[in-house]
């Protein structure tokens, strides 16, 4: 069966910035990524970013940046312009759309005792949902 | 043929706003991207944002957030950007330009430009 | 963001020469997928919109001569137009479609001898 991992990370030297890591680990082609903060998208989730293998990456404030980090994972850069940081306590949902598999969804944050730098283990939240 | 027809030129007071439109023909105008970029003498080309029609869908650059609104209106073919608190660094020319099929920011098709004059 | 730089600032060749102009990002723009490189060039007359000559680094759009020739990979770009014409006049600019926001670079000016 499919699986997706997340990662949520706080950088050591930066305790604004956060980098949210995704993976799919299971057979076929990625065709999607979509990676949104408070909820699974479309599911009260708020989009931070889509990433597409042909296409190009398409993102959305406070992302800063998204990237493949291989061709069955991906990164993205946010960027806490606020006095206070809300992505410590937000959830993060990475959905991978493959072919022929369908879509499988998993979410992550930010572990209540992290201290920076050190990031999350591995959360998937079983949403693991085949659209 | 692929067409954006865009508004005519404009000569604002400072603080004021401007709407600005950019009509597109010959395609489905809620299948791609339509993207606003800004050019001024000296500063080059600046992105200021994107809308997908027919969904609620914007993308902003954050320099032009709070300063551009993006609308669209599918049952005219038409995308507008209001620009708010007009100042002198808004003068410029307004491009709208269409998101190609390949790429989500290889911009096939502009409209001719609206220019825009701030000036007391 | 990319940091898009171009250089030349401006040029002025006669006609029936060869140009190239450099176009340099701030980061890879591969796409570790198909190995494309997210370029695109823009040519840009007196006076008109910019229009669209290349895209993913060295395809040539629909109508566009084939003098025109994109070039590079990663993070350094080049435009060569060969045989260049007197209607070759205008401004070039790079832009890296790799990403939001999509940035361009600050241009060459093409000026006809």
């Known amino acids: 069966t499919p699986e997706v991992w997340v990662q949520v990370q706080m950088e050591a030297t930066e305790l604004s910035s956060f980098t949210v890591h995704c993976g799919f680990l299971g057979p076929g082609s990625i065709s999607l990524v979509t990676v949104s903060w408070g909820g699974p998208d479309g599911a009260g989730g708020t989009k931070l970013a889509v990433l597409h293998p042909e296409l190009g990456t398409r993102q959305w404030a406070p992302a800063r940046q998204a990237r493949w980090e291989t061709q069955s994972s991906i990164s993205l850069a946010l960027e806490d312009s606020g006095a206070s940081s809300p992505f410590a306590n937000t959830t993060f949902c990475c959905k991978f759309a493959s072919f022929p598999e369908g879509s499988w969804e998993s979410c992550g944050s930010l572990p209540p005792s992290s201290d920076p730098g050190l990031s999350a283990p591995p959360t998937p939240v079983p949403i693991l949902r085949a659209d | 043929q692929v067409q954006l027809q865009q508004s005519g030129a404009e000569l604002m007071k400072p603080g004021s706003s401007v709407n600005l439109s950019c009509k597109a023909t010959?395609?489905?105008?809620?299948?791609?991207?339509i993207n606003w970029v800004k050019q001024r003498p000296g500063h080059g080309l600046e992105w200021i944002g994107e809308?997908?029609?027919?969904?609620?869908?914007?993308n902003y650059n954050e320099k032009f957030r709070g300063k551009a609104t993006f609308t669209a209106d599918t049952s005219s073919n038409t995308a507008y950007m209001q620009l708010s608190s007009l100042t002198s660094e808004d003068s410029a020319v307004y491009f709208c330009?269409?998101?190609?099929?390949?790429?989500?920011?290889?911009?096939?098709?502009w409209g001719q430009g609206t220019s825009v004059t701030v000036s007391s | 963001d990319i940091v898009m730089t171009q250089s030349p600032s401006s040029l002025a060749m006669s006609v029936g020469q060869k140009v190239t102009m450099s176009c340099k990002s701030s980061?890879?723009?591969?796409?570790?997928?198909?190995?494309?490189?997210?370029l695109a060039w823009y040519q840009q007359k007196p006076g008109q919109s910019p229009k669209l000559l290349v895209y993913?680094?060295?395809t040539r759009e629909s109508g566009v001569p084939d003098r025109f020739i994109g070039s590079g990979s990663g993070t350094d770009f080049t435009l060569t137009i060969s045989n260049v014409q007197a209607e070759d006049l205008a401004d070039y600019f790079c832009?890296?479609?790799?990403?939001?926001?999509?940035?361009f670079g600050g241009g060459t000016k093409l000026e006809i001898k």
């Open positions: 832009q890296q479609h790799y990403s939001t926001p999509p940035t």
């Open positions: 010959d395609y489905t105008f809620t299948d791609y991207w």
């Open positions: 330009a269409r998101g190609s099929d390949y790429s989500y920011y290889a911009m096939d098709y």
């Open positions: 809308i997908l029609p027919g969904s609620v869908t914007t």
């Open positions: 980061q890879s723009l591969l796409n570790i997928f198909n190995q494309k490189n997210f």
């Open positions: 993913f680094a060295s």
